[in-house]
Structures are given as C-alpha cells and as structure tokens.
C-alpha cells in the first residue's frame, strides 16, 4: 500500500508568530531512518520551508538556520514553525519519506491551512 | 532556471562499460533526489536508478541491479550513471529527472543515446 | 512491484475533439499518480501530480482525476500541439513505474 499522511486542516499561529501541528503517518513497514520535510504552497508554487532526518526513537535535527523544531513519537512527528507573519499564511504540506531499510516509500498530506495575523502596535503611552 | 543536461552516450560493445554525467544547475542540487530514467528505441519509460539526499541513500530497477551504480557529487551538482556489463537491451536513451519536492519527476534532461552493439 | 496498465494504446481523434485516457494501477497508490506528455525527439513534459493538481505552465484543458487504483487524463479539447504520447506514473513508492503508454493521434 502506498503511505497515508495526516495533519490538521486548519492551524492558528499564536501572538509570537509561531504555529505548531502534528504530522502523522501510517508506515508500511519497519523504517528506522525517516525524512520529514515541511513544504509550502502558495498558488501553484511549493517551496521547502525546512526538512530533516532521523532515525527512529531519536530527535528530530533541523539546521541551525531553521524556523522550524520537532519532536518524534513512534509515527507521530510534532512540528512548531516559528517567525511567522501574516505574509507567511498559507498551505503546509508535511511530506514523509521511509529512507531506510528498502523499500522507500513517500507520503504526502494535504497540507495545514496556517493562519497568521501579525500583533496590533502597542499604543503610544504618555 | 533549472536545467539537466546529461552527456557521455555513445557507441560501446556488449560487455564493456559507459558512464553518463547530468550537470544540473538552477537549484538547490543536493535538497533533491535524482533519477535515472531509460526509454529504448520506440518504447516507453523504464525508471533505473534513484539516489537519495545522502549519497548512500540509493535504489536500482531490478534490471539495473549489480551492473550499474547511480552516484553524485553534490560540490559539482553533477549525477552519474556508471553502466557495467552492457548489454544489446540497454540500448535506450537516457534522461536525468529532479524528483520534485511533492515527489514526480518536474525536470528532465533532453536525454543521451546510449547503443550497446557489436 | 506496482503495475500500471494504459488503455487504449491508441487514440485517434479530431481536433477539437474531448480525449479520455485511462490508467489503473495494480494495488492502492492512493494520490501518487502523475502524467507526462512526450512528443517524438523530446524528453516528457510532467502535466499532472497528485492525481490532478497541474503542473506549472500545464493548460486548463488537461485535467486528472480518481483515486485508489483507477486514474484518467482527460483533454477537454485537442489542439494540434497534444497529438503525442502520455505516460501515467506512480511515484508512492519503489520501484517508481510508467505505465506502457497512450498514444493520441490525428483521425
């Protein structure tokens, strides 16, 4: 069977422009090595917004540059992006790939609507 | 703008070695896998060879298996095809394809000639 | 391994006429499911991706559709330029497969 991938429809970043949602994935077989990628679609156009690896049992490790930090549990990934603004509101595709051991396999969800809405200003105080 | 361009096809004996290149540029090349991709003469498409992110992160059609060797070199964004042992039926043009970021094949190269005769 | 099988082999229509092409895949690929055009002396040209999302530049005309293990390409109105060879493919897991190919011709 090909690899079913889910996520939430809809996600709220908060008032610090951060956003967190879990991608859930149902493994055909016994993977130990996992690549998790966050992708963003914004009209026809997808970009990488961030993607790492890990092996089984262990944390998830973006680059150091990265918006984005996870956590692992069994088939479950936990994702949080951070930095965002309103600009950024859009479609985020969890996408899984089983590396390791053969056969790959690759799953992709439909994508968590994140809506971002950036702070009012504080007001002046006299 | 992303551009695959394969070389190293030609005219080798049954038995003897071949091995193509893909340069690509206009993206980011090592965020991506790569696949090989055949079509002999009046045929359709056979997928070959993938190569995955890490470079020993790799997979071969069973007719690929233990003859060719699929590598890269993410600091010259080039894709290599080493072809062993070649035989008359892998006489095909073959084509270097991005695997795109929601997993088909976006980009193709315009494809080298490879003809395995005597 | 996955199996896709294309019907017909060949298609012979008019301009302006409505195609519908078919692939079935032997076991679930779930929204893998992608089509390429290729015309004589080219490379493929991808047309569809998950089913029926439309790749970049990819005309209205062409639309995908179906689920599980029954996919069509249809093209809602020939032009000249669609006269050629299309290849369904899934791309879910390996080994990645073509099927064996429709070939849409002038009548």
């Known amino acids: 069977k090909a690899m079913h991938v889910a996520q939430p429809a809809v996600v709220l970043a908060n008032s610090r422009g951060t956003a967190s949602f879990v991608c859930e994935y149902a493994s055909p077989g016994k993977a130990t090595e996992v690549r998790v990628t966050v992708l963003r679609q914004a009209d026809s156009q997808v970009t990488e917004v961030c993607a790492a690896t890990y092996m089984m049992g262990n944390e998830l490790t973006f680059l150091d540059d990265s918006i984005c930090t996870g956590t692992s549990s069994g088939n479950q990934v936990n994702l949080t992006i951070q930095g965002l603004r309103a600009m950024d509101t859009g479609l985020y595709i969890c996408k899984v790939e089983l590396m390791y051991p053969p056969p790959y396999y690759m799953g992709i969800g439909n994508g968590t609507q994140i809506y971002v809405i950036d702070p009012e200003p504080c007001p002046d105080s006299d | 703008q992303v551009q695959l361009v394969e070389s190293g096809g030609g005219v080798v004996e049954p038995g003897r070695s071949l091995r193509l290149s893909c340069a690509a540029s206009g993206f980011t090349f090592s965020s991506y896998g790569m696949h090989w991709v055949r079509q002999a003469p009046g045929k359709g498409l056979e997928w070959v060879a993938v190569?995955?992110?890490?470079?020993?992160?790799?997979d071969y059609a069973d007719s690929a298996k233990g003859r060719f060797t699929i590598s890269r070199d993410n600091s010259k964004n080039t894709l290599y095809l080493q072809m062993n042992s070649l035989r008359a039926e892998d006489t095909a043009v073959y084509y270097c394809?991005?695997?795109?970021?929601?997993?088909?094949?976006?980009?193709w190269g315009q494809g080298t000639l490879v003809t395995v005769s005597s | 391994e996955i199996v896709l099988t294309q019907s017909p082999g060949t298609l012979s229509l008019s301009p302006g006429e409505r195609a519908t092409l078919s692939c079935r895949a032997s076991?679930?690929?779930?929204?893998?499911l992608a089509w390429y055009q290729q015309k004589p002396g080219q490379a493929p040209r991808p047309l569809i991706y998950g089913v029926s999302s439309r790749a970049t530049g990819i005309p209205d005309r062409f639309s995908g559709s179906g689920s599980g293990t029954d996919f069509t390409l249809t093209i809602s109105r020939l032009e000249p330029e669609d006269f050629a060879v299309y290849y369904c493919?899934?791309?879910?897991?390996?080994?990645?497969?073509f099927g064996p190919g429709t070939k849409v011709d002038i009548k």
């Open positions: 394809a991005r695997g795109g970021l929601l997993g088909y094949f976006d980009y």
């Open positions: 493919q899934q791309y879910g897991r390996y080994p990645f497969t």
């Open positions: 076991q679930s690929i779930n929204s893998y």
């Open positions: 190569i995955w992110y890490k470079p020993s992160e790799k």
